[in-house]
């Protein structure tokens, strides 16, 4: 008779997790008798996944019936393959004996498991930054075999081409994963930009998955300050107005101070938003011309979303005609423009620095 | 290792029933055909049926088909044939043997159960 | 069906000596290069034991002293040099069709 050879026809097999895998293993001989016995690996520290005589193999089940006469298919079909299956297995003959002896092996087939990508998570700075400043957004997927796969970074549907990419491990694993950190400068229109970050792989069949970000949770837009003034009134009071514009996110707080005494504070809420995401609002202060001697410095103080106090002050001229009604020279914008000492304390209550 | 469990001696009536056992160890007892031969005092071997225990598949001996029936009990790894109608020539040693190569030979062979049909 | 028949029905060998039992069917055993004879042992109280499958391989643990030959039709089982362990009854079984055995043969030995 001719010498037995145990022939494993795939030197590879790929199945996609939760699939079913077939490891084909046929012997060119019924000599000598003994069993089949499936190892994954080689060497003392081998696997057994099935053993023809012996054992419970839930999830394996032989190709052919065992006891079909003259049996010499000993292929087997391994249920829910998961990553973890992944490895080169080996259909290994047997001779009877007490123990069986082995007698030859086949030449391995090595299991592959496709697994697909988690969605990809994507993550923004921790601390907003403003305009033409740099952030990073990390992107985040796991569990996914084989090891190529590709990522692309976009900006409301632009391609991005500032980010650093690495698969992890960088050797042999049963599954990868990819981190990706992408620097996206910010502009004033950011409020409603998105950043996606785009995952292709060769288990989505085309379809890449998406993770996204919106720019509004990374960015703020400091606002711009300015006074106007309406002409003095019949009763001597001056209403001054102070527009806070183009700022995001809506959390500001404003300080009206005459003469350096806090005469008012508000709390920023329900503002409508503008095209571009931002906000505007617009606080008054009536003033009482004839309660001062002196012309009245008032200052518009405005801190948003923590960041150190923007002042804007005008002067309300007291002396020139004070009764007369729709005189422009009764009020004088001075133009200054201050950001408050960043070295100011936490708590000083003129800043209520922590009102959310 | 394979052992094959069978019951030493059983006496029955004649035109009485007997079910005999062989409680299979060692081995998954789904994967290897189960047969009985039957071997009388002084006499040869004759080979009376098998049974694959994954499926129930049988097979007989024509001169057996009345006779015997063989049945498994997969929870309990146990194959069993019953002999019916017995007569004095049914007094015999009844062996249970499996098939480990799958080539309708017989490997491993219980000790045998000596069946006494007497009145 | 396929009938066997084995001769001698008997025989005696001094120890050492070459004991051959021949297996006849009736019509051949062999199949896709294969030949489906089996021999076993039978010593007195004792289930058989299998000795050689598919006409010449040897079973696990069996002394090289047996040995098998024979296709087709014609079948031979040897014993050399004979020894006192050896002195059982000889079956032939065929597995071409359904299972059958031969008369048996008893071995004796002077």
């Known amino acids: 008779e001719e010498e037995l050879q145990v022939i494993q026809p795939e030197k590879s097999v790929s199945v996609a997790a939760g699939e079913s895998a077939t490891l084909n293993c046929t012997a060119t001989s019924l000599i000598p008798v003994g069993p089949i016995q499936w190892f994954r690996g080689v060497g003392p520290g081998r696997e057994l996944i099935y053993h023809q005589k012996e054992g419970h193999f839930p999830r394996v089940t032989p190709v052919s019936d065992p006891t079909k006469r003259n049996n010499m298919d000993f292929s087997i079909r391994i249920s829910n393959i998961t990553p973890a299956d992944a490895g080169t297995y080996y259909c290994v003959k047997f001779r009877k004996g007490s123990p069986d002896v082995e007698l030859k092996s086949g030449a391995g087939t090595e299991l592959s498991v496709r697994a697909k990508p988690s969605a990809p998570v994507v993550s923004g700075p921790a601390v907003r930054a403003t305009a033409e400043h740099t952030v990073s957004f990390t992107c985040e997927s796991h569990g996914f075999s084989p090891r190529d796969i590709t990522l692309k970074w976009f900006k409301n549907g632009n391609e991005l081409s500032d980010f650093q990419t690495n698969v992890d491990p960088a050797g042999k694993s049963v599954s990868y994963s990819i981190r990706s950190t992408a620097r996206v400068v910010l502009t004033r229109r950011d409020v409603h930009s998105q950043v996606i970050c785009e995952v292709a792989h060769v288990t989505l069949q085309g379809d890449p998955l998406r993770g996204t970000a919106n720019l509004s949770e990374a960015i703020r837009v400091p606002p711009f300050l300015e006074f106007t003034q309406q002409s003095m009134r019949a009763d001597n009071q001056v209403n001054v107005t102070c527009q806070v514009m183009k700022f995001y996110p809506q959390r500001l707080q404003l300080t009206w101070l005459e003469n350096g005494n806090v005469s008012r504070t508000e709390m920023a809420s329900a503002l409508p938003e503008n095209k571009d995401g931002t906000y505007n609002w617009t606080s008054w202060l009536l003033v009482n011309v004839s309660a001062h001697r002196d012309d009245v410095k008032l200052t518009c103080q405005v801190e948003h979303d923590g960041q150190p106090a923007v002042n804007k002050s005008f002067s309300v001229k007291v002396s020139a005609h004070p009764k007369e009604q729709g005189s422009n020279t009764a009020a004088e914008n001075t133009g200054t423009n201050e950001r408050g000492s960043s070295d100011y304390k936490d708590d000083d209550d003129k800043h209520h620095h922590h009102h959310h | 290792q394979v052992q094959l469990q069978q019951p030493g001696t059983e006496l029955v009536r004649p035109g009485a029933s007997v079910k005999l056992s062989c409680k299979a160890s060692g081995y998954t007892f789904t994967n290897y055909w189960i047969n009985w031969v039957k071997q009388r005092p002084g006499q040869g071997l004759e080979w009376i049926a098998m049974?694959?225990?994954?499926?129930?598949?049988?097979h007989y001996n024509q001169i057996f088909k009345d006779k015997a029936t063989l049945t498994v009990d997969k929870s309990s790894n146990t194959a069993y044939m019953q002999l019916s109608s017995l007569t004095s020539g049914d007094s015999a040693v009844y062996y249970c043997?499996?098939?480990?190569?799958?080539?309708?030979?017989?490997?491993?062979w219980g000790r045998g159960t000596s069946v006494t049909v007497s009145s | 069906d396929i009938v066997l028949t084995q001769s001698p029905a008997s025989l005696a060998v001094s120890l050492g000596q070459r004991a051959t039992i021949s297996c006849r069917a009736s019509?051949?055993?062999?199949?896709?290069?294969?030949?489906?004879i089996f021999w076993y042992q039978q010593k007195p109280g004792q289930p058989p034991k299998l000795l050689i499958y598919?006409?010449?391989n040897l079973d696990s643990g069996v002394p090289a002293r047996f040995s098998g030959s024979g296709s087709g039709t014609d079948f031979t089982l040897n014993i050399h040099p004979v020894e006192e362990e050896d002195a059982a009854t000889y079956y032939c079984q065929h597995s071409r069709e359904l299972p059958t055995f031969g008369g048996g043969t008893k071995l004796e030995i002077k």
């Open positions: 049974i694959d225990p994954s499926d129930s598949e049988t």
């Open positions: 598919l006409a010449s």
């Open positions: 019509k051949s055993v062999s199949s896709s290069g294969y030949n489906y």
């Open positions: 043997a499996m098939d480990y190569g799958s080539l309708y030979a017989m490997d491993y």
